[in-house]
Amino acid sequence: EVEKTACPSGKKAREIDESLIFYKKWELEACVDAALLATQMDRVNAIPFTYEQLDVLKHKLDELYPQGYPESVIQHLGYLFLKMSPEDIRKWNVTSLETLKALLEVNKGHEMSPQVATLIDRFVKGRGQLDKDTLDTLTAFYPGYLCSLSPEELSSVPPSSIWAVRPQDLDTCDPRQLDVLYPKARLAFQNMNGSEYFVKIQSFLGGAPTEDLKALSQQNVSMDLATFMKLRTDAVLPLTVAEVQKLLGPHVEGLKAEERHRPVRDWILRQRQDDLDTLGLGLQG
């Protein structure tokens, strides 16, 4: 806590500018008006304040807004955002996507911090659902964001938002998460034609049931081995050799290298040897 001291004569800040970097902490506390700071927050980022000086500026804002900062201030926090605690952020009401983007930009290139996680949580809860624009923004900054959500949280994602999801956004999702996302993706892409549909749905197929895999096998899709290996074992097991051959197309040649790994291993054990022999790969059931 910086103790209250009178501002020296002639040092009262008329605006937020570079001259303030020469102020001691107590001078900033005494000579910078919190209301002035709040209206000129956009200037703070252009001035090379020390971390100690930023602490003083944060303290002034905290005093001015004990119930939480208004969005007009939040949007211009810039590097001051890094000084905020999750407790501070829980007091905020962030509704503008532009504000969210501005704050995520500050943390860009770093892991998702507790502050950012809290900010995102507040923003999404405020919106009521994870809409497409929000998801687009969040996955651009944090490709693993979607897979950090619980199946319950994912259930609030509307099918229309699925259009914003890129394959890499699903890399770390587990089967339970894909079980939630797959039906939404199926609904979102239902009006696309065969080959375009497969390109879009491919990343979500770890949540697909057997019936859908059987249907895909009739569409000449040529699923690659990496995708096949991520399918649910229980969904793969009922597929016949002919269906797997049609589903994979030229990629079926890759089954040999994966014969000891799930789901291929379990699937092989379910097949008749005569059927496996038709694949020409020496697979042993």
Epitope: P250, E253, G254, K256, T278, L279, G280, G282
Partner: antibody
Amino acid sequence: EVQLVQSGAEVKKPGASVKVSCKASGYTFTNYWMHWVRQAPGQGLEWMGNINPSNGGPYYNERFRSRVTMTVDKSTSTAYMELSSLRSEDTAVYYCARPYYGSSYGYFDYWGQGTTVTVSS
Amino acid sequence: DIQMTQSPSSLSASVGDRVTITCKASQDINKYIAWYQQKPGKAPKLLIHYTSELQPGVPSRFSGSGSGTDFTFTISSLQPEDIATYYCLQYANPLRTFGGGTKVEIK
């Protein structure tokens, strides 16, 4: 010992077809797909396609799809590659190659000695 | 299809020199690359698979490294019998593709 023995050199006229054979021995023919690769004079290697010897199902490089036919005769452990509508650019050495499925889709560990096909009027 | 860009297309080096050839894939191929040596009038001979695994009987002066899209093949000390053309092959996709080749000559 694994061996892939190909048929002899061929000289063909433009517009004709050529059929190259590749007889396999030393392994179970139906346990490995057979691939075909060609090499034009002074040029690099070009993958043409492959065939499942068990069910005769081929997959072709898009570039050759309209002109190539790959077949097998399981009884003699022989794979065939026929190329039709020959043109001078098809003058090349044609190789059959067997993959080893140690990882992913497999790399070629055994090759035939190559068959030279010359297309000339 | 995955394109494999190999460079240089030819090189000339002295016996004992270290020779380096690179292959760049148009997309991520993990470590699924093999290297072949081809001498005139002969079929290609497999030297290395899975980026760096040496085939039995291949001299240890041959080595490979890389992952993703960028790969390197090295001859640590060039020998007269190494005069040949070298090719990379990607097998991360069933539709295999080769690099354009590098012709290695002795100065």
